[in-house]
């Protein structure tokens, strides 16, 4: 198909950064300022993305590639190609419709983005809580309570060696 297209389409060989100009008998013309074509054979150039407001320019637009945006400090990217900027919160908080709110008891968030998640339930794995959770940190699970009972040891001593012909006393 590609070979057929290239034989039939007089525009197929205009390089990236140009467009096939129907107003000039289908010769290749450079993309105008603030526009780009990232592939060859284009009949138009695309308008460059502008990083305004809460967006800032991470990579300038060129004749062959679009501008890339990220977010100003205090915000982070969401969506493909950083299509949105969302406000950062502190660790131990989550963003709600009313702004940043502290994590409820029993939940935590160790990042400036995302939602508060429940602490790990150590008992589900038969373990005990070694370090309590906070709004910013998950609990740390330790050994199971049985492993910590008096006299219990995680290492089993080797059986005593017996000489041949002797029965235990």
């Amino acid at each position: 198909f590609e070979r057929t297209r290239s034989l039939q389409d007089p525009c197929s060989n205009c390089p990236a950064g140009t467009f096939c100009d129907n107003n000039r008998n289908q010769i290749c013309s450079p993309c105008p300022p603030n526009s780009f074509s990232s592939a060859g054979g284009q009949r138009t150039c695309d308008i460059c993305r502008q990083c305004k407001g809460v967006f800032r320019t991470r990579k300038e637009c060129s004749s062959t590639s679009n501008a890339e945006c990220d977010c100003t400090p205090g915000f982070h990217c969401l969506g493909a190609g950083c299509s949105m900027c969302e406000q950062d919160c502190k660790q131990g908080q989550e963003l709600t419709k009313k702004g940043c709110k502290d994590c409820c008891f029993g939940t935590f968030n160790d990042q400036k983005r995302g939602i508060c998640r429940p602490w790990t339930n150590c008992s589900l794995d038969g373990k005990s809580v070694l370090v309590n959770g906070t709004k910013e940190r998950d609990v740390v699970c330790g050994p199971s309570p049985a492993d910590l009972s008096p006299g219990a040891s995680s290492v089993t001593p080797p059986a005593p060696a017996r000489e041949p012909g002797h029965s235990p006393q």
Epitope: S6, L7, D9, P10, C11, S12, N13, C14, P15, G17, T18, C20, R24, N25, Q26, I27, C28, S29, P30, G41
Partner: nanobody
Framework: EVQLVESGGGEVQPGGSLRLSCAAS????????MGWYRQAPGKRREFVAA???????VYAESVKGRFTISRDNAKNTVYLQMSSLRAEDTAVYYC???????????????WGQGTLVTVKP
């Protein structure tokens, strides 16, 4: 406005050489393919050679090994170096700006006015 101005034509003996030039203006020369065509008296215009922006070249079978097409993007000029000329090379030679930077089955968007090459003993 696109302009293509050929020069370098003239009379030459069989086996001789000539270099044709085509000075281009009014468009982005470096991103477009250019071609040479010729029209002998009483015959149809025919393809001779073409060169694309990336310098890939294509030649008509009748001129392969004898003619060389080249370009100087800094001077917006395309050249046709012709050697081992024969009587059947006698024609008006035209420079063409090709559509879509294509040298495979090319079609011409704009023509120059032509320059006459005569090969005779």
């Amino acid at each position: 406005e696109v302009q293509l101005v050929e020069s370098g034509g003239g009379e030459v003996q069989p086996g001789g050489s000539l270099r044709l030039s085509c000075a281009a203006s009014g468009f982005s020369f470096s991103i477009n393919a250019m071609g040479w065509y010729r029209q002998a008296p009483g015959k149809r215009r025919e393809f001779v050679a073409a060169i694309e922006s990336g310098r890939n070249t294509v030649y008509a079978e009748s001129v392969k090994g004898r003619f060389t097409i080249s370009r100087d993007n800094a001077k917006n000029t395309v050249y046709l170096q012709m050697s081992s000329l024969r009587a059947e090379d006698t024609a008006v030679y035209y420079c063409g700006l090709l559509k879509g930077n294509r040298v495979v089955s090319p079609s011409v968007a704009y023509w120059g006015q032509g320059t006459l090459v005569t090969v005779k003993p």
